[in-house]
């Protein structure tokens, strides 16, 4: 007897089948950050809540020290939203020196780090000029796309200025990934 | 004979396998809304088209009375885009009373209602200050993320001001969810 | 002997099972575009990188001549981000003629073309008024949703003004789809 005689004829298995509920998945939510001084060309990584409220990690997808660890190779959908808030920005051609934290832009980057590769890879970037006159401002940047990731890859979210990130609600700023 | 001898050796089934085409899914599109009085701390829910044009519900995912009903427990990707449009906004420190359609912010919330739990849970929020001087304005807010939902949960989309929602095209304002 | 005796009792197969790694998928990234004359009511399509860097197509999902070709019918998640950049925009009521790169709006449309159907279908639209005073500006528009597509459908991304698209980095402007 051949095994395939007993599988439905339409099954066409080319690769291991696996139950969807068993796939690596994570949804991380914002926590209070250390409000560091904004350095022009250095984008700090956010850290995240991984188990309270809406946050979870499952099926060997682990969170540690600002990184999501990819436990198996495959195609993942990766997403993040960061809500920024700030005071009136400086957006004229002539900038005034010494005006603290009135940014002309806000940026989110989802970055992949591979230990065997020296340079991190920027997977996704959302960047926006900010020119808000006359009031405080707030706005989200959303990113999401599919990437082929390898076991051992690490994902993080970097921002242009950590002190502008809205950490007040878990639904405003978040980061997630799931194996397709 | 043992049954597993006839399944491919790489199958590694840890949970019920199921055909992807059988999973609960919905994509809902905007319809003209009933104008409601804008209440400061109460965000009205949008209602949706669920079967015409690009809209559909399938595999026991049902739409009723502004809610998407979750037919089985699991991890879902939930998304929405709302396009807002309005007249010149008020964005100076001094606001003028009684200026209709001149918001200082626009907000979208995807909310989960669980009958056994008294308070709705905000899953996702996109909120943006609006400071547009000298012309009418329009802009989208997009949200999407993965959540562990339970059978019987209900999802809705709430907005800060229903009268600002662009209901003119099904591709501008929409709401969807699918079981992963 | 009946075949189902040899399948796990919880399998409940209603439709062909298939390995997830075998599903059509693509992530395309931006390349330098051919500048086209901006026509008011005609939105040009972007062309894309499909194999270098982060870009890939797999499992019969092919890219050709600005189109992603859908190789089999099913429900797909389709997404795109386009980052726009421009000089100071015109946003007063009175517009000045002949001012290049000073748009009053930016728009992204993900369009489906079905050969048997004369008119393209707009699946997703992100449109935003641009009123940036006193400086150059840049900002992304992100779109993503699920659609029931048919074998042979073609997907493209159209923009309101190709000359404003930021083609400088693969993480800023991208387009993808995957079978659920």
């Amino acid at each position: 007897l051949k095994g395939q005689e007993f599988a439905p004829s339409h099954q066409q298995v080319y690769a291991p089948l696996r139950a969807d509920g068993d796939k690596p998945r994570a949804h991380l939510t914002v926590v209070r950050q250390t409000p560091t001084q904004h350095l022009k060309n250095q984008f700090p990584a956010l850290h995240w809540e991984h188990e309270l409220g809406l946050a979870f990690t499952k099926n060997r997808m682990n969170y540690t020290n600002k990184f999501l660890l990819i436990p198996e190779s495959g195609d993942y959908f990766v997403y993040s939203q960061v809500t920024f808030r700030g005071m009136t920005s400086e957006c004229s051609e002539i900038r005034q020196a010494g005006r603290p934290n009135k940014p002309d832009s806000i940026t989110v980057v989802i970055t992949k780090v591979t230990d065997s590769y020296p340079e991190p890879t920027q997977l996704l970037m959302g960047t926006k000029s900010v020119c808000e006159v006359g009031s405080n401002w707030f706005q989200p940047i959303y990113l999401g796309a599919m990437f082929s990731l390898q076991e051992g890859d690490k994902l993080m979210v970097n921002v242009s200025d950590i002190s502008l990130v809205d950490y007040t609600k878990e639904d405003k700023t978040f980061f997630g990934a799931f194996l397709l | 004979l043992k049954g597993q001898e006839f399944a491919p050796s790489h199958q590694q089934v840890y949970a019920p396998l199921r055909a992807d085409g059988d999973k609960p899914r919905a994509h809902l599109t905007v319809v003209r809304q009933t104008p409601t009085q804008h209440l400061k701390n109460q965000f009205p829910a949008l209602h949706w088209e669920h079967e015409l044009g690009l809209a559909f519900t399938k595999n026991r995912m049902n739409y009723t009375n502004k809610f998407l009903l979750i037919p089985e427990s699991g991890d879902y990707f939930v998304y929405s885009q709302v396009t807002f449009r309005g007249m010149t906004s008020e964005c100076s420190e001094i606001r003028q009373a009684g200026r209709p359609n001149k918001p200082d912010s626009i907000t979208v919330v995807i909310t989960k209602v669980t009958d056994s739990y008294p308070e709705p849970t905000q899953l996702l929020m996109g909120t943006k200050s609006v400071c547009e001087v000298g012309s009418n304005w329009f802009q989208p807010i997009y949200l999407g993320a993965m959540f562990s939902l339970q059978e019987g949960d209900k999802l809705m989309v709430n907005v800060s001001d229903i009268s600002l929602v662009d209901y003119t095209k099904e591709d501008k304002t929409f709401f969807g969810a699918f079981l992963l | 002997l009946k075949g189902q005796e040899f399948a796990p009792s919880h399998q409940q197969v209603y439709a062909p099972l298939r390995a997830d790694g075998d599903k059509p998928r693509a992530h395309l990234t931006v390349v330098r575009q051919t500048p086209t004359q901006h026509l008011k009511n005609q939105f040009p399509a972007l062309h894309w990188e499909h194999e270098l860097g982060l870009a890939f197509t797999k499992n019969r999902m092919n890219y050709t001549n600005k189109f992603l070709l859908i190789p089999e019918s099913g429900d797909y998640f389709v997404y795109s981000q386009v980052t726009f950049r421009g000089m100071t925009s015109e946003c007063s009521e009175i517009r000045q003629a002949g001012r290049p790169n000073k748009p009053d709006s930016i728009t992204v449309v993900i369009t489906k073309v079905t050969d048997s159907y004369p008119e393209p279908t707009q699946l997703l639209m992100g449109t935003k008024s641009v009123c940036e005073v006193g400086s150059n500006w840049f900002q992304p528009i992100y779109l993503g949703a699920m659609f029931s597509l048919q074998e042979g459908d073609k997907l493209m991304v159209n923009v309101s003004d190709i000359s404003l698209v930021d083609y400088t980095k693969e993480d800023k402007t991208f387009f993808g789809a995957f079978l659920l």
Partner: antibody, heavy 120, light 107 residues
Framework: QVQLQQWGAGLLKPSETLSLTCAVH????????WNWIRQPPGKGLEWIGE???????NYNPSLKSRVTISLDTSKNQFSLKLTSVTAADTAVYYC??????????????WGQGTLVTVSS | EIVLTQSPGTLSLSPGERATLSCRAS???????LAWYQQKPGQAPRLLIY???SRATGIPDRFSGSGSGTDFTLTISRLEPEDFAVYYC????????FGQGTRLEIK
Amino acid sequence: QVQLQQWGAGLLKPSETLSLTCAVHGGSFSGYYWNWIRQPPGKGLEWIGEINHAGITNYNPSLKSRVTISLDTSKNQFSLKLTSVTAADTAVYYCARGYCRSTTCYFDYWGQGTLVTVSS
Amino acid sequence: EIVLTQSPGTLSLSPGERATLSCRASQSVRSSYLAWYQQKPGQAPRLLIYGASSRATGIPDRFSGSGSGTDFTLTISRLEPEDFAVYYCQQYGSSPTFGQGTRLEIK
């Protein structure tokens, strides 16, 4: 050694605006949250709100409509304004530094406290 | 907001005894955000424990903290005369809150 020194009017009439200032000595504004906390006589502590070096504020929802916290980086000072005060706002008001490092957060330095009494 | 409930309201003990103070949260709290403070009359609060279990600089080792989720405990292994004061637990989420306090008095 970081020191927080605070001052402001101690006696107010109902409907007036409470105004307090806290000076930070021996430390940087950057990298911390700068808080106001109050304690009514014989009662517990209530967090009022905070500001970071970027001027971004976060307020107790119950007081949000009446509170403004601001900072003056040039003087290493931050300030509290509470409008439309009533007798219920009578309390000792403290400024405090909020320290957050690698997800651990706490108030590590406190001002000496200022008793504010609201009475007609 | 997260409500912290401390018990008992007042604890009467003698020097040399062991004191156990409880703090219960209305919902789960990150352990790393849970702190304990001591306050004496006319003074500002003083940090004792942070991250639920780490002693602040200069705090004697008779003070210890434990717990996770919604239940946290401050223990003083052998009470010294200077330990009689009011103790507050505090969570440092996006909207920080304090417990109502436990008064530790000499029996």
